[in-house]
Amino acid sequence: MSITGISPITEYLASLSTYNDQSITFALEDESYEIYVEDLKKDEKKDKVLLSYYESQHPSNESGDGVDGKMLMVTLSPTKDFWLHANNKEHSVELHKSEKPLPDQAFFVLHNMHSNSVSFESKTDPGVFIGVKDNHLALIKVDSSENLSTENILFKLSETHHHHHH
């Protein structure tokens, strides 16, 4: 799968929550960032993530929400110079400081699911999705397309701002 173009086609600043309305939050600790899944009260500030959308070419036999051999991939950045990365070896989702061009581990295929929810499939390990495990984000293997609606890999985006890159 190759990404067409170096610049994102669009960007959204959104808060990320799980299917059952827990918030994905980020905390700086000892010069590294931790990712949490928390129950927040309505008046507690939700953390924001910048989602950068890229168009990618992919072989016709691959699944995804693309049309005409194109599909959407995203990178997720909660703070400047830090992006979510898939650590396929450890089955973990981590925040790492990176410079552009970003490594493939920072890209996720975006699947639009039912009820305004989305899921994020690892670019480097197809069939593996960002999911929730024990109040943390983890990489979760999904065996078949029927299991794509499993709740622990579904997320909701609450859009707060919309950037267009010209």
Epitope: T25, A27, Y36, E38, L40, K41, K42, E44, K45, N135
Partner: antibody, heavy 121, light 107 residues
Framework: EVQLVDSGGDQVQPGRSLKLSCVAS????????MTWIRQVPGKGLEWIAS????????YYPDSVKGRFTISRDNAKDTLYLQMNSLRSEDTATYYC??????????????WGQGTLVTVSS | DIQLTQSPSTLPASLGERVTISCRTS??????LCWYQQKPDGTVKRLIY???TLESGVPSRFSGSGSGTDYSLSISSLESQDFAMYYC?????????FGQGTKVEIK
């Protein structure tokens, strides 16, 4: 489920010291400020100490400043209140409470069950 | 410090009755007000925050309203478990301060 369990209350003589503890579970302790609140028997509630989520800053009213010290151990999900130079007017039930998340939201969403401190000779 | 004055201090009431507790602040607190219930065994529970937002799991018979310096807590139809002490708290300005409490008791 969020739980706060207070302990360490006892009967002590005036001028002595006592340390209270509060063990937290069911939430990410290090993301929240924490607070101690007390209630003199038959009276209202009084805020007595707060600590930021990292433990870097602490706040007290004049009534306990210089005598009481709030601290926390984020690795153990535990809040402490060190009380020195105790006076009879410190006799109260002491509650720990979860305060605001970093600096957003509203305070004291969850409370411990309280622990009774009696200062008497 | 901001002073909070609750009234009445005691509120005798009957099951099924609608009751309202008032909390007046010495200066404007911009809706930064919570309401707490304390049971006879000492257990404290937050009912409402941000003046009118009900905590999840709190029955809808409880409601909060107000602005500026005048706030209130209402219980639309009293149930037996509602006989307790109620406190307001302002968190607009440090130090956070509580009202002196209102005891809702059986008439």
């Amino acid at each position: 489920e969020v739980q706060l369990v207070d302990s360490g209350g006892d009967q002590v003589q005036p001028g002595r010291s006592l340390k209270l503890s509060c063990v937290a579970s069911g939430f990410i302790f290090k993301n929240y400020w924490m607070t101690w609140i007390r209630q003199v028997p038959g009276k209202g509630l009084e805020w007595i100490a707060s600590i930021t989520n990292s433990g870097g800053n602490t706040y007290y009213p004049d009534s306990v400043k210089g005598r009481f010290t709030i601290s926390r151990d984020n690795a153990k999900d535990t809040l402490y209140l060190q009380m020195n130079s105790l006076r009879s007017e410190d006799t109260a039930t002491y509650y720990c409470a979860r305060d605001r998340r970093y600096n957003s939201g509203s305070p004291f969403a969850y409370w411990g069950q309280g622990t009774l401190v009696t200062v008497s000779s | 410090d901001i002073q909070l004055t609750q009234s009445p201090s005691t509120l005798p009431a009957s099951l099924g009755e609608r009751v309202t507790i008032s909390c007046r602040t010495s200066q404007s607190i911009n809706n930064n007000l919570c309401w707490y219930q304390q049971k006879p065994d000492g257990t404290v529970k937050r009912l409402i925050y941000s003046t009118s937002t009900l905590e999840s799991g709190v029955p809808s018979r409880f409601s909060g309203s107000g602005s500026g310096t005048d706030y209130s807590l209402s219980i639309s139809s009293l149930e037996s478990q509602d006989f307790a002490m109620y406190y307001c708290l302002q968190y607009a300005t440090y130090p956070w301060t509580f009202g002196q409490g209102t005891k809702v008791e059986i008439k």
